[in-house]
Amino acid sequence: NQDLPVIKCVLINHKNNDSSVGKSSSYPMVSESPEDLGCALRPQSSGTVYEAAAVEVDVSASITLQVLVDAPGNISCLWVFKHSSLNCQPHFDLQNRGVVSMVILKMTETQAGEYLLFIQSEATNYTILFTVSIRNTLLYTLRRPYFRKMENQDALVCISESVPEPIVEWVLCDSQGESCKEESPAVVKKEEKVLHELFGTDIRCCARNELGRECTRLFTIDLNQTPQTTLPQLFLKVGEPLWIRCKAVHVNHGFGLTWELENKALEEGNYFEMSTYSTNRTMIRILFAFVSSVARNDTGYYTCSSSKHPSQSALVTIVEKGFINATNSSEDYEIDQYEEFCFSVRFKAYPQIRCTWTFSRKSFPCEQKGLDNGYSISKFCNHKHQPGEYIFHAENDDAQFTKMFTLNIRRKPQVLAEASASQASCFSDGYPLPSWTWKKCSDKSPNCTEEITEGVWNRKANRKVFGQWVSSSTLNMSEAIKGFLVKCCAYNSLGTSCETILLNSPGPFPFIQDN
């Protein structure tokens, strides 16, 4: 047994529809034959470090990194990825080898990097290093831009790891609110990767290629603004960079800015300050807080304080995975024929969603607007008062969300009739769904007031194309009414509509609309 390797590293590729891939990183089912990654001892390294062969993975592929340890006794372990420690649950296989697994579901850019596994056995300690990268395929991608500080300069670099190479531009605005809309004259665009002018009110970086355009705003706390009722909230995924800018203006230079995380000053190297005089000789100071690759413990309240301004905070939340939070219960609306109305969905999501509105198998563009409370809203007003089912669908890299709406238009029934040898039927799509009456017209009742109750059958059916309800009523023909005129009437709270039918021998039936 001595010549067996102490440690074996394997890669398991899972088929994308493979239901065997569990959410847990303990021991998923093997779906394809494992690929040996070698795991050679790394020379000239302090301690026992094994290095697995580099792993290249397709975007959205699911894999398991697995280590088999042939060592006596119990083992304990810890995974570390981008400075974050991840849960590790070893188990033993039939040959009594310790098995440690890391499942990566739907590979994305943020999951690429070095995975370190620390193993402690009764005999010794090991470190195993896996390097996972995304395979360079011809698939086009467009990644949201992120910021980096330029080495030895007070400037930001905007980076978007996209294929084909995107055009990067800074979008700057120096006024407040609505006037910072994309096409406003207050907006200045600079098609370059490096930005030195970092004192503006609103700073965004956008990247565009054949797939479209993605933007990232520089998260800013402005101490000259009145503190908001709702604390601003910033979401990031583990491994992403954090950038928050604190900005303050004062009549002179006699003030300073500080950043704290949960009441502890940020460590040096996690902030940098810039200041300038504005045109009216007031002093503008900005202080950046930044973390090049966030871990779970970077979550918390980041507070910017000044000796001359009220302090303000932002809640930074680091998540393992993106999310879309919204209520997915379906909603029904009824509106008048000329009433102004919009569907709306309020959601909290990270990363930003891509969305569509769909009606009758036709998709419509979807706009989102950020609200002050950290939520976003998407509205759809272009329904043209067509009743039916409307669907809102949203997705980001990690989550999907669908919500159904039903629109009913209040209107007086419109009746259509059809008949056969044995029965007469009337249909109406008015809303609220109408009730029906059948009346017989005769010498005794020239105004058709004699009600028919026998042989009437009412039903409502869903007209699938638009998801709108149609009500129908059918009268089975009897000897008592054959040869007579009958009238079917549909009525709801908005009015009544009738159709008169002559029940004669088989053949075409004349219908008389009678409103």
Epitope: L231, N263, P310, S311
Partner: nanobody
């Protein structure tokens, strides 16, 4: 569990004074800055004053010179002394620490 409890509200005549208190628990009080906000019927909640953990105070323009904010770290309490009250000061007053809010105390100023 962070809890904030306001007290000291009531009915007062224009020109009169009130002292509001905000008692905090479940938070490192001395390490936190505290804000007072108020909300009049039909209006948005608006910021009134702040005291930093170092004891510096800041005020909205509408209350400057009339209101004074102070803190007693030993009692985990912040106070808002309101003088020369006006009918437009009528509102529910809330204190806040970070994302945490109290239930509010009603202040009514009659003319």
């Amino acid at each position: 569990q962070v809890q904030l409890q306001e007290s000291g509200g009531g009915l007062v005549q224009a020109g009169g004074s009130l002292r509001l208190s905000c008692a905090a628990s479940g938070v490192t009080f001395s390490a936190s800055y505290i804000d007072w906000y108020r909300q009049a019927p039909g209006n948005e909640r608006e910021w009134v004053a702040q005291i930093t953990r170092g004891g510096d105070s800041f005020y909205a323009d509408s209350v400057k010179g009339r209101f004074a904010i102070s803190r007693d770290n030993a009692k985990n309490t912040v106070y808002l002394q309101m003088n020369s009250l006006k009918p437009e000061d009528t509102a529910v007053y809330y204190c806040r620490v970070l994302s945490y809010w109290g239930q509010g105390t009603q202040v009514t100023v009659s003319s």
